[in-house]
């Protein structure tokens, strides 16, 4: 059985049948007897109890409000009411795109791993019994496919995969021919395998700081979802109260791989935090990676050439 | 789904020592480190020690220094505390619980690694 | 070690009640601060980190504010899956620090 419609919050495309399944559904089968009632709201108009006699366009079957089709002022709120259960819908319905064979705000992106499998299948469970034929559109063409009533792509994906696929099934329904439309925007990336993990930056830095003063260290780089970025500094990280480690940021970049950031914070810097190495380090399966900074008096600058500080 | 399963309830005499394990499953267990919290009958939460899963690294309480041993063994994926001169005061459940000062941002809702994941405590009972 | 101080110790409220927790640290620990709840027999749950953020999959009514050594915890409308005993954590610094409780209990 077709599941029920739990989302609260719902757009759909004019034009298209479309319906709403509650999600009492068995409750409602056991209590035959009992009155259940289909409202809308909209606007100024407070609960209308909706019939078929309402409008042509809609059917009442058991636990579904069907709309034959949607059109752009079925837009509101629309409430099933049971004996003491309630369930309640926001319907957004918006105008279809003229120039296309889709809706642009109607598109489920997917992201596919080049060589890895990618699958498209045409099908619609709860009208499948309606359906006469379903296409498959790749970027608004026809893609020439054996089955016409589930056409299917299942291969490895290459580059030239990428598009908008479009499955739209015809149906009849009262001497009607209509059509529904799914539209999934197929992105091929690179492979996500693992990367090896990279600090970003100088592996050594001198940093100028004044003493009293505090800094901020900034450790970053580009991992995988399972490496770490840590910080080893003194004989026991936590042994000195001005040394602080922060929390990490880590941030998935558009390729699947993760962006992290790491800071070292140290207050009141004193003579014991000059000329000592605080470590970065990011660690994998692969082995490690480390960059090192140095604080340094800013009157020591001198000494050391330029391109080597840090701000 | 992710969880930590601790050992079994202790019943130690005063002097001895306990070792409470702390398996890890449903994530990469030396990604994250792993803290180690107390708590006596009818009392609050006391923090413990931590120890960094991927190289090691401890931070302990500074009234359990010299008594108190976090270690793990990455190959079964368990963290292990040991507490010795056990003492009467010692009684109490011990939790042990994924932390990682890290979060997370993939799609809309971050999520923080920091003590997120709790095991279900192991009782240790100290007395003579 | 840094200590935390936690207000009131215990109150009572009722369903739909707006709850108020403070907890106050000895020194600035910026907004390094976590809530925890814990009911009877079971392990602490994590709510709110960084002060303000709501740990994900934790219901909205939950909210923490403040920073440097002042924070709160709110419960907006109080439920009864709610009454527990909430506890604050610094982690600013190590060792870090539990405040000693609220238990929010049944008026």
């Known amino acids: 059985a077709e599941s029920c419609t739990s989302r609260p919050h719902i757009t759909v495309v004019e034009g298209e049948p479309f319906y709403l399944k509650h999600c009492s559904c068995s409750l409602a089968h056991e209590i035959e007897t009992t009155t259940k009632s289909w409202y809308k709201s909209s606007g100024s108009q407070e609960h209308v109890e909706l019939n078929p006699r309402s409008s042509s366009r809609i059917a009442l079957h058991d636990c579904v409000l069907e709309f034959w089709p949607v059109e752009l002022n079925d837009t509101g709120s629309y409430f099933f009411q049971m004996k003491n259960y309630t369930q309640k819908w926001k319907l957004n319905v918006i105008r279809r795109n003229k120039h296309s064979c889709f809706t642009e705000r109607q598109v489920t992106s997917k992201i596919v791993e080049v060589k890895k499998f990618f699958q498209i299948t045409c099908e619609n469970s709860y009208y499948q019994t309606l359906v006469n034929s379903t296409s498959l559109y790749k970027n608004c063409k026809k893609l020439l496919l054996e089955n016409n009533k589930n056409p299917t792509i299942k291969k490895n994906a290459e580059f030239e995969d990428q598009g908008y696929y479009s499955c739209v099934h015809f149906l009849h329904h009262n001497g009607k021919l209509f059509n529904i439309t799914k539209t999934f925007n197929i992105t091929i990336v690179e492979d996500r395998s693992n990367i090896v993990p990279v600090l970003l930056g100088p592996k050594l830095n001198h940093v100028a700081v004044e003493l009293g003063k505090n800094v901020r260290l900034n450790c970053s780089a580009l991992l995988n979802e399972e490496d770490v970025i840590y910080w080893m500094f003194g004989e026991e990280n936590g042994s000195d109260p001005n040394i602080h480690e922060e929390k990490e940021m880590r941030i998935m970049t558009p390729e699947g791989k993760w962006h992290a950031s790491k800071v070292l914070r140290i207050e009141n810097i004193g003579e014991s935090n000059l000329n000592v190495l605080y470590n970065c380090t990011v660690a994998s399966t692969g082995g490690t990676d480390t960059k090192s900074f140095i604080l340094v008096r800013k009157a020591d600058m001198a000494d050391i050439p330029g391109h080597v500080f840090t701000r | 789904q992710v969880q930590l399963v601790q050992s079994g309830a202790e019943v130690k005499k005063p002097g001895a020592s306990v070792k409470v394990s702390c398996k890890a499953s449903?994530?990469?267990?030396?990604?994250?480190?792993i803290s180690w919290v107390r708590q006596a009958p009818g009392q609050g939460l006391e923090w413990m020690g931590w120890i960094r899963t991927y190289n090691g690294n401890t931070n302990y309480a500074q009234k359990l220094q010299g008594r108190v041993t976090m270690t793990t063994d990455t190959s079964t994926s368990t963290a292990y505390m040991e507490l010795r001169s056990l003492r009467s005061d010692d009684t109490a459940v011990y939790y042990c619980a994924r932390d990682e000062a890290r979060i997370v941002v993939a799609g809309t809702t971050p999520y923080y690694y920091g003590m997120d994941v709790w095991g279900q405590g192991t009782t240790v009972t100290v007395s003579s | 070690a840094i200590q935390m101080t936690q207000s009131p110790s215990s109150l009572s409220a009722s369903v739909g009640d707006r709850v108020t927790i403070t907890c106050r640290a000895s020194q600035d620990i910026r907004n390094d601060l976590g809530w925890f709840q814990q009911k009877p027999g079971k392990a602490p749950k994590l709510l709110i980190y960084a002060a303000s953020s709501l740990q994900s999959g934790v219901p909205s009514r939950f909210s923490g504010s403040g920073s440097g050594t002042d924070f709160t915890l709110t419960i907006s409308s109080l439920q009864p899956e709610d009454f527990a005993t909430y506890y604050c954590l610094q982690d600013y610094n190590y060792p870090r620090t539990f405040g000693q409780g609220t238990k929010v209990e049944i008026k």
């Open positions: 449903g994530y990469t267990f030396n990604s994250y480190g």
